[in-house]
């Protein structure tokens, strides 16, 4: 891949990014796993979904997530005076009507039931990483990525471009 980018000041512009079009440009059903090949699983508990990061038993079926890709335009610089460039944003839905959301106050990743149009908290900038990995940066909190903490998904602040290769924010997407 192109190698991972940095974040920092530039990503303040993500707040002002605009999703081009209401419908996704494409969709992809995939299993989501960590850099260390642990699976991201979703369990219905007390009428709400919990998200886990765990080792699956042999032949245990992986949970799938529907990634919906959106083309997004972002301002050319921090002042936002003009447009330059395109980004790919995604929403992630493990089951009908439920989407991953960034809860920036709690630094957590949650599954919320909601209707379209989806709130900004459900959108993540998709980064094409080295070693066939991706990372997910919050649209609502630039420089903050979905990561793994204590066998759960959490929001992790990445404070410099050198730290973007940190394994706990790297994920693998697979059709199997």
């Amino acid at each position: 891949a192109f190698g991972i980018s940095g974040v920092q000041k530039y990503t303040r512009a993500l707040h002002d990014s605009s999703i081009t079009g209401i419908s996704p440009i494409t969709e992809y059903l995939a299993s989501l796993s960590t850099y260390n090949d642990q699976s991201i699983t979703f369990a219905l508990e007390d009428e709400s979904y919990e998200i886990y990061v765990e080792d699956l038993k042999k032949d245990e079926k992986k949970d799938k997530v529907l990634l919906s890709y959106y083309e997004s335009q972002h301002p050319s610089n921090e002042s936002g005076d003009g447009v330059d460039g395109k980004m790919l944003m995604v929403t992630l839905s493990p089951t009908k009507d439920f989407w991953l959301h960034a809860n920036n106050k709690e630094h957590s990743v949650e599954l919320h039931k909601c209707e379209k149009p989806l709130p900004d908290q459900a959108f993540f900038v998709l980064h094409n990483m080295h070693s066939n990995c991706v990372s997910f940066e919050c649209k609502t909190d630039p420089g903050v990525f979905i990561g793994v903490k204590d066998n759960h998904l959490a929001l992790i602040k990445v404070d410099s471009s050198e730290n973007l290769c940190t394994e706990n924010i790297l994920f693998k997407l697979s059709e199997t």
């Epitope: 192109f2 974040v7 980004m87 094409n128 973007l164």
Partner: antibody, heavy 119, light 111 residues
Framework: EVQLVESGGGLVQPGGSLRLSCAAS????????MSWVRQAPGKGLEWVAT????????DYVDSVKGRFTISRDNSKNTLYLQMNSLRAEDTAVYYC????????????WGQGTLVTVSS | EIVLTQSPATLSLSPGERATLSCRAS??????????LNWFQQKPGQPPRLLIF???NRGSGVPARFSGSGSGTDFTLTISSLEPEDFAVYYC?????????FGQGTKVEIK
């Protein structure tokens, strides 16, 4: 305005060395993966090398591995290509390119600098 | 290495006509459900300019007459009605894997 300006090209003898520079402006340099792409006179485009925003990863086309080194100085907003053991077939216009935010494609290109390897 | 083959090598058309350019990959350029195939335009003495990314999405400031389609290994760039400024060389490029490769180019010339 996003701008990439290459410099350092010129005439060099086979076996010689040259260092190309690319000065970036109008964006937060360290947030983007950068690459070099070359074009021999009258020919098509060839990707040469890429470096990640945080300098963690580099990749090269096989034909330049061990001879060329891509690097960057994020404090100076500058990309470099150190070219050693130059050959006639390295003669080309060398373009500095910036990936889009997220690193999916080459989005911004400089005007290029011509490197001529000849005795 | 993924080899990209463009056809035709040269396309001779008049302004107002429709141009259809083809790019075929030696293997699929799909990754993460995306077709990582991009199109660039290059005019003499100028650097390439991004037209289309991920097979079908226009770059910033690219006119609507340019459109891309295709998936897997077969891709098409269409210019619905050629303007005088569209006569140039067009390259496809894959960003699925290193080494990133380009097609040999299609020259669209005035008939």
């Amino acid at each position: 305005e996003v701008q990439l300006v290459e410099s350092g090209g010129g005439l060099v003898q086979p076996g010689g060395s040259l260092r190309l520079s690319c000065a970036a402006s109008g964006f937060t340099f360290s947030s983007f993966s950068m690459s070099w792409v070359r074009q021999a006179p009258g020919k098509g485009l060839e990707w040469v090398a890429t470096i990640s925003g945080g300098k963690t990863f580099t990749d090269y086309v096989d034909s330049v591995k061990g001879r060329f080194t891509i690097s960057r100085d994020n404090s100076k907003n500058t990309l470099y290509l150190q070219m050693n053991s130059l050959r006639a077939e390295d003669t080309a216009v060398y373009y500095c390119t910036r990936a889009n935010y997220g690193n999916w494609f080459f989005e911004v290109w400089g005007q290029g600098t011509l490197v001529t390897v000849s005795s | 290495e993924i080899v990209l083959t463009q056809s035709p090598a040269t396309l001779s058309l008049s302004p107002g006509e429709r141009a259809t350019l083809s790019c075929r990959a030696s293997e699929s350029v799909a990754k993460y459900g995306l077709s990582l195939l991009n199109w660039f335009q290059q005019k003499p003495g100028q650097p390439p300019r991004l037209l289309i990314f991920a097979a079908s999405n226009r770059g910033s400031g690219v006119p609507a007459r340019f459109s891309g389609s295709g998936s897997g290994t077969d891709f098409t760039l269409t210019i619905s009605s050629l303007e005088p400024e569209d006569f140039a060389v067009y390259y496809c490029q894959q960003s699925k894997e290193v080494p990133f490769t380009f097609g040999q180019g299609t020259k669209v010339e005035i008939k």
